[in-house]
């Protein structure tokens, strides 16, 4: 807590500028008007204030806005955002995607801080759901964001948001997460034609049931082995040799290299040897 002292004569700040870096903490407290600071927040980031000086500026804003900062101030917090506590952020009502982007930019390239985690939770709750634009923004800064949500949380993601998901956003998802995301993707991409549909749905196929894999096998999709290896074992097991051959197309030869790995191993064991022999790969059931 900075002690209340009168501002020395001639030191009252008419605006937020570089001259303030020479002010002692008590002078900043006494000579900078909080309302002026609020209207000129965008200037603070261009000035090399010390952490101690930033603490004073934050204190002034806290006094001016005890119920939480307005969005016009929040949007221009810049590095002052790093001084906020999760408790401070819980008082905010951030509704603009531009504000969210501005604050995420401050933390860019770093692990999600408690401040950012709280901000995102507040923002998403305020929007009511994880809409496409929000998801687009979050995955741009945090590619693993989607895979950091529980299956229960993912169940509230609307199918329309799936359009924002890039293949790399699903890299760290586990099978249970894909189980939730796949039906949403199927719904989101349902009006696309065969080859375009496959390109979009491919990353989500780790959650696909047997009947959908059977349907894909009729569409000349030529699934690569990397995708096939990520399919649910229980979804692959009922597929016939002919269906797997159609599903993989020219990539079917890759089964030999993967014959000891799931789901290929388990699938081979379910097939009749005569059927496996039709592939000419020397697979032994």
């Amino acid at each position: 807590e900075v002690e209340k002292t009168a501002c020395p004569s001639g030191k009252k700040a008419p605006e937020i500028d570089e001259s303030l870096i020479f002010y002692k903490k008590w002078e900043l407290e006494a000579c900078v008007d909080a309302a002026l600071l609020a209207t000129q927040m965008d200037r603070v980031n261009a000035i090399p204030f010390t952490y101690e000086q930033l603490d004073v500026l934050k204190h002034k804003l806290d006094e001016l806005y005890p119920q939480g900062y307005p969005e016009s101030v929040i949007q221009h917090l810049g590095y002052l955002f790093l001084k906020m506590s999760p408790e401070d952020i819980r008082k905010w009502n951030v509704t603009s995607l531009e504000t969210l982007k501005a604050l995420l930019e401050v933390n860019k390239g770093h692990e999600m801080s408690p401040q950012v985690a709280t901000l995102i939770d507040r923002f998403v709750k305020g929007r009511g759901q994880l809409d496409k634009d929000t998801l687009d923004t979050l995955t741009a800064f945090y590619p693993g964001y989607l895979c950091s949500l529980s299956p229960e949380e993912l169940s509230s993601v609307p199918p329309s948001s799936i359009w924002a998901v890039r293949p790399q956003d699903l890299d760290t998802c586990d099978p249970r997460q894909l189980d939730v995301l796949y039906p949403k993707a199927r719904l989101a991409f349902q009006n696309m034609n065969g080859s375009e549909y496959f390109v979009k749905i491919q990353s989500f196929l780790g959650g696909a049931p047997t009947e959908d894999l059977k349907a894909l096998s009729q569409q000349n999709v030529s699934m690569d082995l990397a995708t096939f290896m990520k399919l649910r074992t229980d979804a692959v097991l009922p597929l016939t040799v002919a269906e797997v051959q159609k599903l993989l197309g020219p990539h079917v030869e890759g089964l030999k290299a993967e014959e000891r790995h799931r789901p290929v191993r388990d699938w081979i064991l379910r097939q009749r040897q005569d059927d496996l022999d039709t592939l000419g790969l020397g697979l032994q059931g």
Epitope: H110, E111, M112, P143, Y145, S148, S150
Partner: nanobody, 115 residues
């Protein structure tokens, strides 16, 4: 930088139990998912179980009902309680910590189940 250290592996008879631990050091905030994977000799690494930021859990079909994943936030540790172990559970078990930005792996701990 996050470091993960697994422990608790060993040799156990079929039907027996083991409890694996994974201690995380370094700072991670925000949403964290802790997962266990395993890799048997000559096989691909496969997912075993997850515990999400919300506390909810999920399991792969082969271990459902036999394994339980839990965590102690105060100790920054995640556990895998493995009951009714089978020879097919023999593998190196790896702990994974997933954040919204990165994925970190431990060195693994060997579990051998003899018949």
């Amino acid at each position: 930088q996050v470091q993960l250290v697994e422990s608790g592996g060993g040799l156990v008879q079929a039907g027996g139990s083991l409890r694996l631990s994974c201690a995380a050091s370094g700072s991670t905030f925000g949403r964290i998912v802790m997962r266990w994977y395993r890799q048997a000799q000559g096989k691909q690494r496969e997912w075993v179980a997850s515990i999400y930021d919300s506390g909810s859990t999920s399991y792969s079909d082969p271990v459902q009902g036999r394994f339980t994943i839990s965590r102690d936030n105060a100790r920054n540790t995640v556990y895998l309680q493995m009951n009714s172990l089978r020879p097919a559970d023999t593998a190196v078990y790896y702990c994974n910590l997933g954040t919204a930005l990165s994925s970190y792996w431990g060195q693994g701990t060997q579990v051998t189940v003899s018949s």
